[in-house]
């Protein structure tokens, strides 16, 4: 039976075996097409999610779909039920926390009182002034906290205590990519990790350790990528893996926060990268130990220069490295997080591509996660 399962797939009606390599090859080999069912699936960007959180103290903003304008949520009459609705609109199922924060002097959006209508937040029609003088600061999930803060140095061995959201994504027990835990059910990674193998069965996630081979594997229920855009083939390098069973969080298994929608990082902002990838460009071997390194945001104009990526870095990507080169992500680090620390750790980028590893004019290129928040929320909502 083990041999059969490893090399063959059972089609139903009529019952017969097909070679496992025919799974998810794009051709319907079983009469009912079930060989193409448990495969990497694409999901469109979907409609605009009508709530979002700002980097200004994680304050809640609500979209008026009639005008397309965004408004800040006033704390007046804001309830736990409204907080849960807001978080559900973003696809979260966990219990949120919220508090009042003072309206700041730089508040540039109109502030409105919030109500609920058919499980979506709405602005109260006859909204008067915000009497409390406070906005809603909302956290849908406790995230981005680790037991240990890394030291700012070049490249060094990492501890899972510092990066409890880091996972190894493996195909047939071989490490292929990194990834980040976003919540008990979901792991964030890069779409290109699944180009070679699009069947879900053989993919596993390993969490909770900084050593590659030493932790139990978790079954994957679904792998979802964003709809492919032929105009920008390198864009949309983002994937979500839904785990078959929710993770139990601990000191070494925790989620990282998604970035705020307005998380604009200026050049030279310090960031962190981690992974088990190659330590040399053509080193041919994964690192057994998780490695960490500090890098910085590199200006997209510089990154797109003639001696660098010549316009291939789009608005949905970002570059990071160090100006003199030598510190970079490499093969095997793909899908892992590019991280920024404010109050919590945020995954601002996903290791995506680059020419070589560590070259001074060709730094690492990362999927800009803030460009895909809408897609992430729509996937989560569809899977709630």
């Amino acid at each position: 039976k083990v041999i059969l399962d490893k090399y063959y797939f059972l089609c139903g009606q009529p019952l017969h075996f097909i070679p496992r390599k025919q799974l998810c090859d794009g051709e319907l080999d079983c009469p009912l097409g079930e060989d193409e069912e448990h495969c990497v699936k694409s999901f469109p960007e979907g409609p605009a999610v009508a709530v979002r959180l700002s980097k200004d103290r994680s304050t809640l903003q609500v979209l008026d779909s009639a005008t397309g304008n965004w408004f800040s949520a006033c704390f007046d009459n804001f309830t736990e039920a409204l907080a849960e609705t807001a978080c559900r609109q973003m696809g979260y199922s966990s219990k949120p926390t919220f508090r009042a924060v003072e309206i700041g002097p730089d508040q540039d959006l109109d502030v409105v009182e919030i109500t609920e209508n058919s499980q979506e937040l709405r602005m109260r029609n006859s909204s008067g002034p915000c009497l409390s003088g406070s906005l809603v600061s909302l956290h849908c999930l406790a995230c981005g906290k680790s037991l240990k803060t890394p030291r700012v140095v070049g490249v060094e061995e990492a501890s899972v205590d510092s990066w409890p959201w880091q996972v190894s994504i493996q195909y047939d027990k071989q490490h292929v990519c990194g990834g980040s835990i976003l919540d008990p059910h979901w792991v964030l990674t890069a779409a290109h990790c699944f180009r070679k193998h699009t069947d879900v069965f053989n993919w596993k996630v390993r969490a909770g350790s900084d050593k590659l081979g030493s932790f139990p594997s978790l079954a994957v229920a679904k792998i979802i990528i964003i709809e492919f855009n032929p105009m920008y083939p390198k864009d949309n390098d983002i994937a979500l893996m839904k785990l078959q069973f929710p993770l139990t969080f601990s000191g070494t298994v925790r989620p990282i926060c998604l970035p705020f929608f307005d998380e604009e990082l200026t050049p030279a902002t310090p960031l962190w990268i981690i992974g088990w990838g190659f330590t040399k460009q053509n080193g041919g071997k994964m690192s057994d130990i998780l490695l960490q390194a500090s890098v910085q945001v590199i200006d997209s104009t510089r990154c797109n220069a003639d001696d660098a990526y010549q316009g291939e870095v789009t608005e949905k990507m970002m570059c990071a490295g160090i100006p003199e080169g030598g510190v970079d992500t490499c093969q095997g680090d793909s899908g892992g997080p590019l991280m920024y620390q404010s109050d919590q750790w945020h995954v601002v980028g996903i290791v995506s591509w680059g020419y070589g590893c560590g070259g001074p004019s060709t730094p690492g290129v990362y999927t800009k996660v803030s460009a895909y928040l809408n897609w992430i929320y729509n996937v989560w909502k569809a899977e709630l």
Partner: antibody, heavy 119, light 107 residues
Framework: EVQLLESGGGLVQHGGSLRLSCAAS????????LHWVRQAPGKGLEWVSS????????YYADSVKGRFTISRDNSKNTLYLQMNSLRAEDTAVYYC????????????WGQGTLVTVSS | DIQMTQSPSSLSASVGDRVTITCRAS??????LAWYQQKPGKAPKLLIY???NKDTGVPSRFSGSGSGTDFTLTISSLQPEDFATYYC?????????FGQGTKVEIK
């Protein structure tokens, strides 16, 4: 087996309209980018239009923009090309093609359908 | 639009010959280049994508190389079934554009 079967070609007057269809079978239709590519008699290949799996992204060659409309019906496994205001230079064999998963290039093609525009 | 120029336009060769076709882009296209083979009265067939990756089922005698603006398709030992027209195509920017084709004929 992946199959793409174009239909709807034929002779049409200058300024007229035609609707090409491409019936697909043997693959997970709704997961793939689809394309129309044409070839004028004795000439080279010309990309005409592309449509992404859920129709979110649609692109046209400048030569057909505003006159041709690509669409797909994932429930019927069919790709369409609505061609209006046809010109003599639109005379060609029109191929429908399935894009590979990445980078979306046409890797399965139909046998083509001939469109002839008479002036 | 990005112009693709193939050379030669046609060539005559014998079975067993090594054949090289070149394709030049009017601007840098990184590795976003594909090669197709087309036989008379038939639809094109994808051979090579992203400059050097062989599509499934393509014989090992076909290889692609190059990046930026200059690309090459090589048939290491020409077989009778290889006599056809070959097209390069860039997918760096829409509109996707093809070269004018290279016809490989029997000498």
């Amino acid at each position: 087996e992946v199959q793409l079967l174009e239909s709807g070609g034929g002779l049409v007057q200058h300024g007229g309209s035609l609707r090409l269809s491409c019936a697909a079978s043997g693959f997970a239709f709704s997961s793939y980018v689809l394309h129309w590519v044409r070839q004028a008699p004795g000439k080279g290949l010309e990309w005409v239009s592309s449509i992404s799996s859920s129709s979110s992204y649609i692109y046209y060659a400048d030569s057909v923009k505003g006159r041709f409309t690509i669409s797909r019906d994932n429930s019927k496994n069919t790709l369409y090309l609505q061609m209006n205001s046809l010109r003599a230079e639109d005379t060609a064999v029109y191929y429908c093609a399935r894009g590979d998963r990445y980078p979306g290039l046409p890797n399965y093609w139909g046998q083509g359908t001939l469109v002839t525009v008479s002036s | 639009d990005i112009q693709m120029t193939q050379s030669p336009s046609s060539l005559s060769a014998s079975v067993g010959d090594r054949v090289t076709i070149t394709c030049r882009a009017s601007q840098g296209i990184s590795s976003w280049l594909a090669w197709y083979q087309q036989k008379p009265g038939k639809a094109p067939k994808l051979l090579i994508y992203q400059a050097s990756n062989k599509d499934t089922g393509v014989p090992s005698r076909f290889s692609g190389s190059g990046s930026g603006t200059d690309f090459t398709l090589t048939i290491s030992s020409l077989q009778p079934e290889d006599f056809a027209t070959y097209y390069c195509q860039q997918s760096y920017r829409i509109p996707w554009t093809f070269g004018q084709g290279t016809k490989v004929e029997i000498k």
